[in-house]
């Protein structure tokens, strides 16, 4: 798993990016954990990155992800998501040139090395949920969310609005 220092080294290089004609409105580093406080970690294995959901040891450092926020031109139907009522989308990058991607065919979440402009599969609609949690909905497949399945991240279909509060699609963002 990467430490924060590795992320900080490349963060500034990403700031100048203009993605599919749009540029981010704000960016910051945060660790990602599940509703049940398991950490999302990233490990280099056989020249590719794997994503894990695991309990960290007491003093183990959490991996950080660079969140880049974008405004969608589509209106938000959630109250409190912006004066303009615009939806927010995010991209998530745990290390230089790699972004989380939705693989809708395999129902999986993968880390892909990308050049700009980033593909739509790297964008997720951000939803503010209860208990200070967020959820990430695939831009390319509405109703499909990043979730936790068998200690890995996976794409999970949410059939109704009641299921939006299902714990396995809820995540916490933390600066520590």
């Amino acid at each position: 798993a990467f430490g924060i220092s590795g992320v900080q080294k490349y963060t500034r290089a990403l700031h100048d990016s203009s993605i599919t004609g749009i540029s981010p409105i704000t960016e910051y580093l945060a660790s990602l954990s599940t509703y049940n406080d398991q950490s999302i970690t990233f490990a280099l294995e056989d020249e590719s990155y794997e994503i894990y959901v695991e309990d960290l040891k007491k003093d183990e450092k959490k991996d950080k992800v660079l969140l880049s926020y974008y405004e969608s031109q589509h209106p938000s139907n959630e109250s409190g998501d912006g004066v303009d009522g615009k939806m927010l989308m995010v991209t998530l990058s745990p290390t230089k040139d790699f972004w989380l991607h939705a693989n809708n065919k395999e129902h999986s979440v993968e880390l892909h090395k990308c050049e700009k402009p980033l593909p739509d599969q790297a964008f997720f609609v951000l939803h503010n949920m209860h208990s200070n949690c967020v959820s990430f909905e695939c831009k390319t497949d509405p109703g499909v969310f990043i979730g936790v399945k068998d200690n890995h991240l996976a794409l999970i279909k949410v059939d109704s609005s009641e299921n939006l509060c299902t714990e396995n699609i809820l995540f916490k963002l933390s600066e520590t």
């Epitope: 963060t11 910051y28 109250s79 998501d81 912006g82 004066v83 963002l173």
Partner: antibody, heavy 123, light 108 residues
Framework: EVQLVETGGGLIQPGGSLRLSCAAS????????MSWVRQAPGKGLEWVSA????????YYADSVKGRFTISRDNSKNTLYLQMNSLRAEDTAVYYC????????????????WGQGTLVTVSS | EIVLTQSPGTLSLSPGERATLSCRAS??????LSWYQQKPGQAPRLLIY???HRATGIPDRFSGSGSGTDFTLTISRLEPEDFAVYYC??????????FGGGTKVEIK
């Protein structure tokens, strides 16, 4: 209507304490980070403090660290600034401000501002 | 602490002219920078966020550019209501957040 209303300002002696409140309405308060920004008479804007939407992260300007405490009560849609050990240089109009986007984190611009409340520290 | 230096301190121009305001950060703030307009007795008003995004309701004569350490606010054609003080503000992940000292745009 989205609105912020500050109260609690007034005349206070050096070394005294004051608590400012900012009542928010018209939006989902807990989704937004909030800040206090002040402006001394005839001077520029000075960022004072910020707090994340959950209240779990707080930030302070060096000039107020250890003396001021920011907090929020999301059930009451209210932001607070507890000011202790006040000095003459703390004299200013204090604005509360809301971030533009509902990302809960403080790394954002300020779209909504209150009308400000004047704090005067003088003997 | 990241220091924002605005220049010039005062800009004397006539209506219809172009105004170019500069904001320089002592270290990189990426795109996490905004611009505000303030008139006497009023709270500041957000003009630009994310370095280049115009806030809702802001006329398109206002534009922002830059990233990293050097930023510019441009008013393409000054209208009478544009004469005010302008502040830049950085909110990068290195609190404390800071404002620049301001640029006053006055009528020549």
């Amino acid at each position: 209507e989205v609105q912020l209303v500050e109260t609690g300002g007034g005349l206070i002696q050096p070394g005294g304490s004051l608590r400012l409140s900012c009542a928010a309405s018209g939006f989902t308060f807990s989704s937004y980070a909030m800040s206090w920004v002040r402006q001394a008479p005839g001077k520029g804007l000075e960022w004072v403090s910020a707090i994340s939407g959950s209240g779990g992260s707080t930030y302070y300007a060096d000039s107020v660290k250890g003396r001021f405490t920011i907090s929020r009560d999301n059930s009451k849609n209210t932001l607070y600034l507890q000011m202790n050990s006040l000095r003459a240089e703390d004299t200013a109009v204090y604005y509360c401000a809301r971030t533009l986007h509902g990302i809960r984190a403080a790394y954002d611009a300020f779209i909504i501002w209150g009308q400000g409340t004047l704090v005067t520290v003088s003997s | 602490e990241i220091v924002l230096t605005q220049s010039p301190g005062t800009l004397s121009l006539s209506p219809g002219e172009r105004a170019t305001l500069s904001c320089r950060a002592s270290q990189s703030v990426g795109i996490n920078l905004s611009w505000y307009q303030q008139k006497p007795g009023q709270a500041p008003r957000l003009l630009i966020y994310g370095a280049s995004h115009r806030a809702t309701g802001i006329p398109d004569r206002f534009s922002g550019s830059g990233s990293g350490t050097d930023f510019t606010l441009t008013i393409s054609r000054l209208e009478p209501e544009d004469f005010a003080v302008y502040y830049c503000h950085q909110y990068s992940q290195s609190p404390p957040f800071t404002f620049g000292g301001g640029t006053k745009v006055e009528i020549k």
